[in-house]
Amino acid sequence: SGTTNTVAAYNLTWKSTNFKTILEWEPKPINQVYTVQISTKSGDWKSKCFYTADTECDLTDEIVKDVKQTYLARVFSYPAGHVESTGSTEEPPYENSPEFTPYLETNLGQPTIQSFEQVGTKVNVTVQDEWTLVRRNDTFLSLRDVFGKDLIYTLYYWKSSSSGKKTAKTNTNEFLIDVDKGENYCFSVQAVIPSRRTANRKSTDSPVECMGHEKGESRE
């Protein structure tokens, strides 16, 4: 089972949001297939996505075991129709991925405003806590469970009649803000991990929710 006609994978890229983590690479295979291996810096290699014709491999199950570890993956190229053979000593071409530390590098998914409630001149805005595939004691953890106080939310709020966006911040999933009586407000939230120094400190903004629509309620 020679590897003379296979080309090494390239452009290995981690795509990760809220710990759902996929390794992507090129090229689209012509007469070849791929197998992925992943390990921590000090651990053994584990094979995934055996002899696949895809150019991506979902590695979520592996990285959620310890999201604070640093992982390395590699993609091996084999001829199409390759069958594992004990007699083969030739190592297939492979390419290493960049290192990936999920806790520091997973992108923050778009948050959702769960509800808002007005009581007089106060509005309580609640952000939905997203579930992740990270587990502790056989229980799936939420984004807040994983990041704790490292995760904050920035609320943008503005009068429907105005464009200027005021801000508020919380390290829980709730905001309590002052509003002008009789005015309708709109809201959008953004997840932020301020301690990150990289280009993924912020999530995309949530969809805008406005008072007078079904998500909110008002009490005097």
Partner: antibody
Framework: EVQLVESGGGLVQPGGSLRLSCAAS????????IHWVRQAPGKGLEWVGY????????YYADSVKGRFTISADTSKNTAYLQMNSLRAEDTAVYYC?????????????WGQGTLVTVSS | DIQMTQSPSSLSASVGDRVTITCRAS??????VAWYQQKPGKAPKLLIY???FLYSGVPSRFSGSRSGTDFTLTISSLQPEDFATYYC?????????FGQGTKVEIK
Amino acid sequence: EVQLVESGGGLVQPGGSLRLSCAASGFTISQYWIHWVRQAPGKGLEWVGYIDPYNGYTYYADSVKGRFTISADTSKNTAYLQMNSLRAEDTAVYYCARDYGSLRVSLDYWGQGTLVTVSS
Amino acid sequence: DIQMTQSPSSLSASVGDRVTITCRASQDVNTAVAWYQQKPGKAPKLLIYSASFLYSGVPSRFSGSRSGTDFTLTISSLQPEDFATYYCQQHYTTPPTFGQGTKVEIK
């Protein structure tokens, strides 16, 4: 190293316009917030406005609302303050500052400032 | 808008003196208060964040505290390089607001 450098200040007549720039290095502005703060000669600090360059959201002090516009070009890692209908009371040193964006830390890095003088 | 009332507006002190500057917020701002030092012709520099935390590289003679809506900046032993103007700032709500400043001069 985080750095903010303002430019574009100068002498302008009342009613005139000026655009200030705030060039950032050492960090990506879209992942933070940029504020403008001014200081009239011999006076204290006055907040002017902010932008979230990630989504373009802004908010302004009442004293400049409708006259000043903050924008950002993330490809140039630069924020701008467009000042129109300038008045004598807008004379000040204008600083841009980075907002770290946490509950605990706000304006952690400031530029050196640029002087705007509004006079006939 | 939240008002930050800072006092005194100026004070004279000698090297080695203990100096206290106060700021009162017009409503609750939690601990979202920072203190800045500014020297003539220079930009403000962050000294204290979150009411009582010393910013990186700032000498330990500077400290901050909070009691309700009252915030205090203390310089335990004034040094020659500490003669400057000090500002408090709240960032609890938009717009953020500054105190009027306290000029610390040599006696």
